[in-house]
Interface confidence: medium
């Protein structure tokens, strides 16, 4: 399977109190689960809606309600793929104060789509 | 038409076992997730837990976590909420929905009746 | 665990605004949804990710969040919005979610 994280760079810059929208890609693979993972652990939250774009490429999505200090960090996704872990490259996620000018490449994904998500 | 249908009002003894099933149509079954929620007699809604669209995680409330087993068949497009031993408390509407947030898609509602 | 509060009963007269208010700890950083239940039947999604009004719901319905608190609006309540409301949302963690206890609309 190949994974990407899209619509972000290597750094994603948000000012705090912001939300914060991270796609993942997965080719390659008929329904994957992915899994968000921050610093080497796995996000305790339940999943984002899965973006079927085709039958082997489906897009995931990890939101944030409201970054905190305690959001900074680099994140990936990964699914299993025939036992084995695959991982994403990384994304880095820093905050600059509240009000301050961020590069919010996190509006990125397609503004169509509407998906389920608790976190601010 | 998306529609799940639920299986048959039950009544069991306490200490029972009982697996009541919720069929699923009209989309695909993995594309979403499947919720199941209680609501007791007169009582509010109580999220009890739901499964991943793909059938291979699960995430329980703390209430029921241990007590309650959900599972799904994905060839059938059947999710499951399981009890090994019932207790009076078990008596209650369970609906299972589709989704975990935006719960769009409700069941009619399986009732459970525990009583000696 | 997790709980979110609820008031238990809200009357207004119709016509006027009803305010149904929602209380978490988790609240400033998670979304909260609502759903309406009436008598004998299954709930419906009112509102969703705070503020987002659901498909088919009348444009009195609208939602608010700030800090710990998430508030349900419906400006010129009606007869038919008679019914229990309940707020959904996660814990702080974000493993399992949580409904509030309901709160009981009473249009007359």
């Known amino acids: 399977a190949g994974l990407k994280l899209m619509g972000a760079p290597v750094k994603l810059t948000v000012s705090q109190g912001q939300p914060v929208k991270l796609n993942c890609s997965v080719e390659g693979m008929e329904e994957p689960d992915i899994q968000w993972v921050k610093d080497g652990a796995v996000v305790q939250n339940l999943d984002q809606l899965y973006i079927p774009v085709s039958e082997q490429h489906w897009i995931g999505f990890l939101s944030l309600k409201s970054v905190e200090r305690s959001d900074a960090g680099r994140y990936w996704c990964q699914v299993e793929d025939g036992g084995e872990t695959e991982i994403s490259q990384p994304v880095w996620l820093t905050l600059v104060p509240r009000g301050s000018s961020a590069h919010h490449h996190h509006h990125h994904h397609h503004s169509a789509w509407s998906h389920p998500q608790f976190e601010k | 038409e998306v529609q799940l249908v639920q299986s048959g009002a039950d009544v069991k003894k306490p200490g029972a076992s009982l697996t009541i099933s919720c069929q699923a149509s009209?989309?695909?079954?993995?594309?979403?997730?499947i919720s199941w929620v209680r609501q007791k007699p007169g009582k509010g809604l109580e999220w009890m837990g739901s499964?991943?669209?793909?059938?291979?995680?699960?995430h329980y409330g703390p209430s029921f976590q241990g007590h309650v087993t959900i599972s799904a068949d994905r060839s059938t497009a059947t999710a499951y909420l399981q009890w090994r031993s019932l207790e009076a408390s078990d008596t209650a509407m369970y609906y299972c929905?589709?989704?975990?947030?935006?719960?769009?898609?409700w069941g009619p509602g399986t009732l459970v009746t525990v009583s000696s | 665990s997790y709980e979110l509060t609820q008031p238990p009963s809200v009357s207004v007269s119709p016509g006027q605004t009803a305010r149904i208010t929602c209380s978490g700890d988790?609240?400033?950083?998670?979304?909260a949804y609502w759903y309406q239940q009436k008598s004998g039947q299954a709930p419906v999604l009112v509102i969703y990710?705070?503020?987002k009004r659901s498909s088919g719901i009348p444009e009195r319905f609208s939602g608010s969040s700030s800090g710990t608190m998430a508030t349900l609006t419906i400006s010129g309540a009606q007869v038919e919005d008679e019914a229990d409301y309940y707020c959904?949302?996660?814990?702080?963690?974000?493993?399992?979610?949580?409904f509030g206890g309901g709160t009981k609309l009473t249009v007359l």
């Open positions: 929905v589709r989704g975990y947030t935006h719960l769009r898609t």
């Open positions: 009209g989309y695909t079954f993995t594309d979403y997730w």
């Open positions: 499964i991943t669209r793909s059938s291979s995680r699960t």
């Open positions: 988790a609240l400033p950083k998670k979304y």
């Open positions: 990710e705070d503020s």
């Open positions: 959904y949302s996660a814990n702080q963690r974000g493993n399992y979610m949580v």
